[in-house]
Interface confidence: low
């Protein structure tokens, strides 16, 4: 939905076009409960609370109201070169029985948080991927967002600042480090099946072989690249299902923890591998505790309800020092009907080899 704040002479100073999903934890008499709901289509800008700001006293704010007393507020600020949603706040009324059935208290609660929504002055902020803002007991996820404050001509600028999540992430193998010590190449890793289930059934099915490609400095100051296979027989799998995030956590030998995070683009209904985190121990390394993470990947993409399949080896670069080689991957996230893989979307590598 589009939300606009105008000043006294009718010129727009804030324009925002987004959909939003709310996840709220609250107490009922029978214990804690989580409710998820979307910003309804009849949500409106509260004109007497929203503001274009005053030169010396306040900054622009967008206040959106819906339901029985819920308001979402975006407070903007700027410096010399950039503006941002410095603070997002959400007021919710637990007496709204449509949204919060059986709430044990009927109070009005307010939560707030800083955000990473920011853009260059005279550019719009654009984020197709979900932007999550975590507050106390509440998570707000903005989808397919276009936002701009401090407008100069009552319309979105042509130029845009893209959010971190939308920026492309290379999925090629990392470049070889300067003259690393050679490392014996292990065989291809064994392929294993993984599944993650939640209260609504299976949210992740995966079949793949996993190999870690690690570059690190040894105690003798030499740089080495090692390939480590994840052995399914020595790996415990767990995970979690969420409306916008599905995780697969693998605990393997050598105190290795490998975490995969799958995200979903609601506007295009596609899932993708969004993040990888690794914690492991390398006994011969100068710093034995090896940690790496990247939460803005774009790999293994397919339409929700379909599966992604690739027989060719895929290299997913996580950091300069760490990539994951994925063998014979077949994966489906979020929507898995009957515990079976859906229609297959082949990777480009396979299509090119056909």
């Amino acid at each position: 939905a589009m939300f606009i704040v105008k000043n006294g002479n009718g010129t727009a100073c804030i324009m925002a076009n987004f959909s939003a999903a709310f996840s709220v934890n609250y107490d009922t008499k029978s214990g804690p409960k989580n409710m998820t709901f979307d910003l309804p289509s009849d949500a409106k800008v509260v004109l007497n609370s929203s503001s274009c700001g005053k030169e010396n006293t306040s900054d622009p704010s967008l206040v959106i109201a819906f339901g029985r007393g819920q308001t979402l507020t975006l407070n903007f600020t700027r410096n010399a070169t950039r503006y941002s949603v410095q603070l997002m706040s959400f007021v919710y009324n637990l007496s709204d029985t449509h949204l919060f059935p059986n709430a044990s208290s009927k109070e009005i609660k307010t939560v707030e948080s800083i955000t990473d929504i920011r853009a260059d002055i005279d550019k719009k902020y654009r984020c197709v991927s979900g932007t999550q803002v975590h507050m106390n007991n509440v998570t707000v996820t903005l989808h397919d967002a276009t936002i701009q404050a401090y407008l100069s001509n009552s319309s979105f600028s042509r130029e845009e600042t893209r959010c971190e999540q939308d920026r492309p992430s290379p999925t090629t193998a990392p470049p070889a480090p300067p003259s690393p010590s050679p490392s014996p190449v292990p065989e291809s890793p064994s392929v294993d099946k993984y599944n993650v289930s939640g209260t609504n059934g299976t949210c992740l099915l995966a079949s793949m072989g996993l190999q870690l490609n690690l570059t690190y400095e040894r105690k003798d100051n030499t740089t080495v690249t090692r390939l480590l296979n994840i052995n399914p027989n020595k790996t415990l799998a767990s995970g979690s299902c969420g409306a916008h995030l599905v995780t697969l956590e693998l605990h393997s030998e050598g105190s290795t923890v490998l975490l995969f995070q799958f995200g979903m683009n609601a506007s295009s209904s596609r899932f993708f591998l969004q993040g990888i985190q690794l914690n492991t121990t390398l006994p011969d390394a100068r710093d034995p505790a090896f940690k790496a993470a990247n939460s803005s990947l774009r790999a293994l993409q397919a339409t929700v309800g379909n599966s992604y399949k690739c027989n060719a080896e895929e290299h997913v670069r996580v950091t300069k020092a760490f990539s994951v080689n994925i063998f014979k991957v077949w994966v489906q996230a979020f929507k898995v009907e009957g515990g079976q893989f859906g229609s297959v979307e082949e990777c480009l590598l396979d299509e090119n080899n056909m």
Epitope: T77, N79, Q86, H134
Partner: antibody, heavy 122, light 111 residues
């Protein structure tokens, strides 16, 4: 009350890495940015950057971008800074501090940890 | 990067007198009527402490002896009257743009 408890002093060799922690208590961790500031012996203060625990994204002073990695663990309300490829120039006290948003009056660092001293010596 | 120049580098003031510290920015730290300049106190062996935010606003719990003023590029920090407990180094800091920068500090001593 708000408290930022930093990890103990570190002694490291040149070329090594160190990882320091800053455990926050007394407030909602994800509602504020966590900043890191460096102070060399007898010198002034240098801003390294901050981590936003809500979104998981860091923002770096370009001067420190290749030297430091800022992270956080929301489950334990703890922020981390890792210094890589240590040299004698990295010998300093490193402070974590909370970024507080004063509405239109901007951000300032309203609470500070006690600092972690890093000594790089062969 | 915005450079903040503090003066004097050190200052000796008698108890009960006024101490004044200046901070000059290489470019304006005002925008839209807001000033992104703050002042901190650091006592020997301790962490910095926020005293003044946004040029002139006293942080909660800070005595009214401390005050700040200024806009644009020129700022002043004042302690009146000075007490023995005020022996410390005082820093100005801007965050109108990244990277945030601090002044070089002013060391306050008692005469």
């Amino acid at each position: 009350q708000v408290q930022l408890q930093q990890s103990a002093a570190e002694l490291a060799r040149p070329g090594a890495s160190v990882k320091m922690s800053c455990k926050a208590s007394g407030y909602t961790f994800t509602s504020y940015t966590m900043h890191w500031v460096k102070q060399r012996p007898g010198q002034g203060l240098e801003w390294i950057g901050y981590f936003n625990p809500s979104s998981g994204y860091p923002e770096y002073n370009q001067k420190f971008k290749d030297k430091t990695t800022l992270t956080a663990d929301k489950s334990s309300n703890t922020a981390f800074i890792q210094l890589n490829s240590l040299t004698s120039e990295d010998s300093a006290v490193y402070y974590c501090s909370r970024g507080y948003y004063y509405g239109s009056r901007g951000y300032a660092l309203d609470f500070w940890g006690q600092g972690t001293s890093v000594t790089v010596s062969s | 990067n915005i450079v903040l120049t503090q003066s004097p580098a050190s200052l000796a003031v008698s108890l009960g007198q006024r101490a004044t510290i200046s901070c000059r920015a290489s470019e304006s730290v005002d925008i839209n009527g807001n000033t992104f300049m703050h002042w901190y106190q650091q006592k020997p062996g301790q962490s910095p402490k926020l005293l003044i935010y946004a040029a002139s606003n006293l942080e909660s719990g800070v005595p009214a002896r401390f005050s700040g003023s200024g806009s644009g590029t020129d700022f002043t920090f004042t302690i009146d009257p000075v007490e023995a407990d005020d022996v410390a180094t005082y820093y100005c800091q801007q965050n109108i743009e990244d990277p945030w920068t601090f002044g070089g500090g002013t060391k306050l001593e008692i005469k």
